[in-house]
Interface confidence: low
């Protein structure tokens, strides 16, 4: 159950309501838990998790990644620039999360939960952002053709793509989690 839809919250009205920051923190950790479960199935199914990071880096996926200029690192931290990067990055990840939807057998519901929870997280963060104009939304047509291309890959490349998406998304969320705690 995603945070905010927790039945325990209904049963305990005396509990202090979560602040906006706490909700975001909880939401990210919920998604990370989901990614962990998906990674488990992926690693059990293929040997991708054993591949070296260097070997995996040789791919043509344009997955969002934090860079120094994004203002999310300890050195050169910039709250506004960083928040824009987090939201933009999550919006860019959405097409890859859509791709993951048919990639799991035993964790199909978990894949859907990660996708839906990410949409909720984006909404939380957009409320927090002051400079919404700086956030660029990916082009739907470009996303549709990317999705078609990814789905047309052979089995080995699809396994590789699944693994890379999960690892990169975990990395992006983990960086975001800590950066958001400074805001």
């Amino acid at each position: 159950v995603p945070p905010g839809e927790d039945s325990k919250d209904v049963a305990a009205p005396h509990r202090q309501p979560l602040t906006s920051s706490e909700r975001i923190d909880k939401q990210i950790r919920y998604i990370l838990d989901g990614i962990s479960a998906l990674r488990k199935e992926t690693c059990n199914k293929s040997n991708m998790c054993e591949s070296s990071k260097e070997a995996l880096a040789e791919n043509n996926l344009n997955l969002p990644k934090m860079a120094e200029k994004d203002g999310c690192f300890q050195s050169g931290f910039n709250e506004e620039t960083c928040l824009v990067k987090i939201i933009t990055g999550l919006l860019e990840f959405e097409v890859y999360l859509e791709y993951l939807q048919n990639r799991f057998e035993s964790s199909e519901e978990q894949a859907r939960a990660v996708q839906m929870s990410t949409k909720v997280l984006i909404q939380f963060l957009q409320k927090k952002a002051k400079n919404l104009d700086a956030i660029t939304t990916p082009d739907p047509t470009t996303n549709a053709s990317l999705l078609t291309k990814l789905q047309a890959q052979n089995q080995w490349l699809q396994d590789m793509t699944t693994h890379l998406i999960l690892r990169s998304f975990k990395e992006f969320l983990q960086s975001s989690l800590r950066a958001l705690r400074q805001m």
Epitope: I28, Q74, Q182
Partner: antibody, heavy 122, light 109 residues
Framework: EVQLVESGGGLVQPGGSLRLSCAAS????????MSWVRQAPGKGLEWVSA????????SYADSVKGRFTISRDNAKNTLYLQMNSLKPEDTAVYYC???????????????WGQGTQVTVSS | QSVVTQPSALSVTLGQTAKITCQGG??????AHWYQQKPGQAPVLVIY???SRPSGIPERFSGSSSGGRATLTISGAQAEDEGDYYC???????????FGGGTHLTVLG
């Protein structure tokens, strides 16, 4: 070359106080979170305390909360650990550790000092 | 406080592969980092963020993580790899580091 040099350790009686220092060089000290990690004789590593880059946010292990205070002087490139009400179980080698900059991800330490010995005994 | 569990000791024959595991609920949403410590020396970071290797660390060291379980793999263990290995994660707040109890690796032969 990154260097972290701890000092201020020694023998102290239970209930006494000590102030540890860690002199940092070879990196922009004011840009990085820092921690103290200790190791009791023959035991494993135990995280003690952390402080963010600016010094405005600190956190402590339950075992030292209320007795130890972490601080930093970015102008002097120095990290401190004020230890009060010391107990025999605080006996350990105390390491100063620099947090790696891989974004704001959960703490990871890419450089460690050689440690300073603190012995609490009567 | 989160708990991270790892075996207390492991033996490997020279040139063989050593796998040290680390388990804990916190590893689901936090990264695993690995440190090597030799007697009388400070710990040295050998793997960070589950599977990244700092510069200067030999390629035989690699890491992986899934489902709350992290693994440090030393492919072709050398005599100089003998020592204590610590897994480190973070507590639920993300501010406090949590260390495993350490695994003493012995390289035989």
């Amino acid at each position: 070359e990154v260097q972290l040099v701890e000092s201020g350790g020694g023998l102290v009686q239970p209930g006494g106080s000590l102030r540890l220092s860690c002199a940092a060089s070879g990196f922009t000290f004011s840009s990085y979170a820092m921690s103290w990690v200790r190791q009791a004789p023959g035991k494993g590593l135990e995280w003690v305390s952390a402080i963010n880059s600016g010094g405005g946010s600190t956190s402590y292990a339950d075992s030292v909360k209320g007795r130890f205070t972490i601080s930093r002087d970015n102008a002097k490139n120095t990290l401190y650990l004020q230890m009060n009400s010391l107990k025999p179980e605080d006996t350990a080698v105390y390491y100063c550790a620099k947090e790696g900059d891989t974004g704001w991800k959960d703490p990871m330490y890419d450089y460690w000092g050689q440690g300073t010995q603190v012995t609490v005994s009567s | 406080q989160s708990v991270v569990t790892q075996p207390s000791a492991l033996s490997v024959t020279l040139g063989q592969t050593a796998k040290i595991t680390c388990q804990g609920g916190g590893l689901r949403s936090s990264y695993a980092h690995w440190y090597q410590q030799k007697p009388g020396q400070a710990p040295v970071l050998v793997i960070y963020d589950d599977d990244s290797r700092p510069s200067g660390i030999p390629e035989r060291f690699s890491g992986s993580s899934s489902g709350g379980r992290a693994t440090l793999t030393i492919s072709g263990a050398q005599a100089e790899d003998e020592g204590d290995y610590y897994c480190q994660s973070a507590d639920s707040s993300g501010n406090a580091a949590v260390f495993g109890g350490g695994t003493h690796l012995t390289v035989l032969g």
